[in-house]
């Protein structure tokens, strides 16, 4: 004969556990049904009656199977420096992430609590480490032979162009200026061509550093010994 299926609520076997999507109610001392995502427990179980679930109200949610008496409140609306990447529904919280040109200075479980504008490296400084979703740009002074003439959160120090004859030497914030040596062009003595490099710049270009952390939001779900908490161990 097949084993009889127990319907909730039921007393677990001594030392046994409740099944998937059930929880052990310590007051009733029974295995009782959890409520599905988007719902919460309106009435807890008794020894003879199972959990009664109800839908989450507007602007509240439950993401996991649970027996919380109240749904969680969705986070406040995204601020002007953020974009809403996930709307508030009965089954998921609103997620706000930082808009382009900003990074997350203070993260929360999902999304970002506080965004800050990415640092801009001023002329004479280039990006040593690009900004990521959760870290700011790191600037460094341009080393001899390199320059940056922009205020930018993305530009790195670039090598000076190499001239046959240098009109104006490069420095950390300005490229070298080459003097024209072509006899075929008629121009006033000392005239400057901007620019007229001899060699291509590509062989001198520094590789762009890889981001220190891969972009992409990481989602953390609560786990652990807080049975009814909406982060109770899920299905």
């Amino acid at each position: 004969l097949p084993a009889q299926v127990a319907f909730t609520p039921y007393a677990p076997e001594p030392g046994g556990t409740c099944r998937l999507r059930e929880y052990y109610d310590q007051t009733a001392q029974m295995c009782c049904s959890k409520c599905p995502p988007g719902q919460h427990a309106k009435v807890f179980c008794t020894k003879t009656s199972d959990t009664v679930c109800d839908s989450c109200e507007d602007s509240t949610y439950t993401q996991l199977w649970n027996w919380v008496p109240e749904c969680l409140s969705c986070g406040s609306r995204c601020s002007s420096d953020q974009v809403e990447t996930q709307a508030c529904t009965r089954e998921q919280n609103r997620i706000c992430t930082c808009r382009p040109g900003w990074y997350c200075a203070l993260s929360k479980q999902e999304g970002c609590r506080l965004c800050a504008q990415l640092r801009k490296c001023r002329p004479g400084f280039g990006v040593a480490r690009p900004g990521t979703e959760t870290s700011d740009v790191v600037c460094k002074p341009c080393a001899p032979g390199t320059f940056s003439n922009t205020t930018s959160s993305t530009d790195i120090c670039r090598p000076h162009q190499i001239c046959h004859v240098v009109a104006i030497p490069g420095n950390a914030s300005m490229d070298a200026v080459c003097t024209s040596t072509s006899p075929t062009r008629s121009m006033a003595p000392g005239a400057v061509h901007l620019p007229q490099p001899v060699s291509t710049r590509s062989q001198h270009t520094q590789p762009t550093p890889a981001p220190s952390t891969a972009p992409g939001t990481s989602f953390l779900l609560p786990v652990g010994p807080s049975p009814p908490a909406e982060g109770s161990t899920g299905d």
Epitope: T27, A28, K42, F44, T48, S49, E70
Partner: antibody, heavy 119, light 106 residues
Framework: QVTLKESGPTLVKPTQTLTLTCTFS??????????VGWIRQPPGKALEWLAH???????YYNPALKSRLTITKDTSKNQVVLTMTNMDPVDTATYYC???????????WGQGTTVTVSS | DIQMTQSPSSLSASVGDRVTITCKAS??????IAWYQQKPGKVPKLLIH???TLQPGVPSRFSGSGSGSDYTLTISSLQPEDVATYYC????????FGGGTKVEIK
């Protein structure tokens, strides 16, 4: 409006049985999720939960007093009755009944009735 | 049985002071805690349930917090009408009240 009112003897002798009745209005014990519990408070002391009964007749008792307590309900009369046997002077207290929500906390209380145990 | 240890047992504070009352459960009660106010000679009145949910009509100066086995009731700015004894109630496993905290005005 939800109201609860306790009634019963104000004086009982040691070893006697106390019978208290809670009569309520504004809700029904046939409604899913409704419950009524009893709590007492000795003079100048803290509250102590005694017993509870749900709409489906499921009952819970304070383990320390379980052998002395019985709780019953009469849904048609909107009443819950608590009996406590073998009364002792230390059981002198104000006895309250209170409504319990489906998520298990007491939200509305009766005015209380004072019971003195003395010979 | 779960024991609830409430502290302090009494306190005296000035009007406008921030007052904090704590309850420690003997085990995790998963936020199933309520707070009651009992004025002298009166019936207990529910202030907060499920750790932090304020009952309708309760002034916003009352707030609750906590998780696991440690819980707090805070009165952000004590008023003369807050003179009372405050009790916590755990309802995670059966029901147990704390010993009470008597709040007086200096």
């Amino acid at each position: 409006q939800v109201t609860l009112k306790e009634s019963g003897p104000t004086l009982v002798k040691p070893t006697q049985t106390l019978t208290l009745t809670c009569t309520f209005s504004g809700f029904s014990l046939s409604t899913l999720g409704m419950g009524v519990g009893w709590i007492r408070q000795p003079p100048g002391k803290a509250l102590e939960w005694l017993a509870h009964i749900w709409w489906d007749a499921d009952k819970y008792y304070n383990p320390a007093l379980k052998s002395r307590l019985t709780i019953t309900k009469d849904t048609s009369k909107n009443q819950v009755v608590l009996t406590m046997t073998n009364m002792d002077p230390v059981d002198t207290a104000t006895y309250y009944c209170a409504r319990m929500t489906g998520t298990r906390y007491f939200d509305v209380w009766g005015q209380g009735t004072t019971v003195t145990v003395s010979s | 049985d779960i024991q609830m240890t409430q502290s302090p047992s009494s306190l005296s504070a000035s009007v406008g002071d921030r007052v904090t009352i704590t309850c420690k459960a003997s085990q995790n009660i998963n936020k199933f805690i309520a707070w009651y106010q009992q004025k002298p000679g009166k019936v207990p009145k529910l202030l907060i349930h499920y750790t932090s949910t304020l009952q309708p009509g309760v002034p916003s100066r009352f707030s609750g917090s906590g998780s696991g086995s440690d819980y707090t009731l805070t009165i952000s700015s004590l008023q003369p009408e807050d003179v009372a004894t405050y009790y916590c109630l755990q309802y995670g496993v059966l029901w147990t009240f704390g010993g009470g905290t008597k709040v007086e005005i200096k």
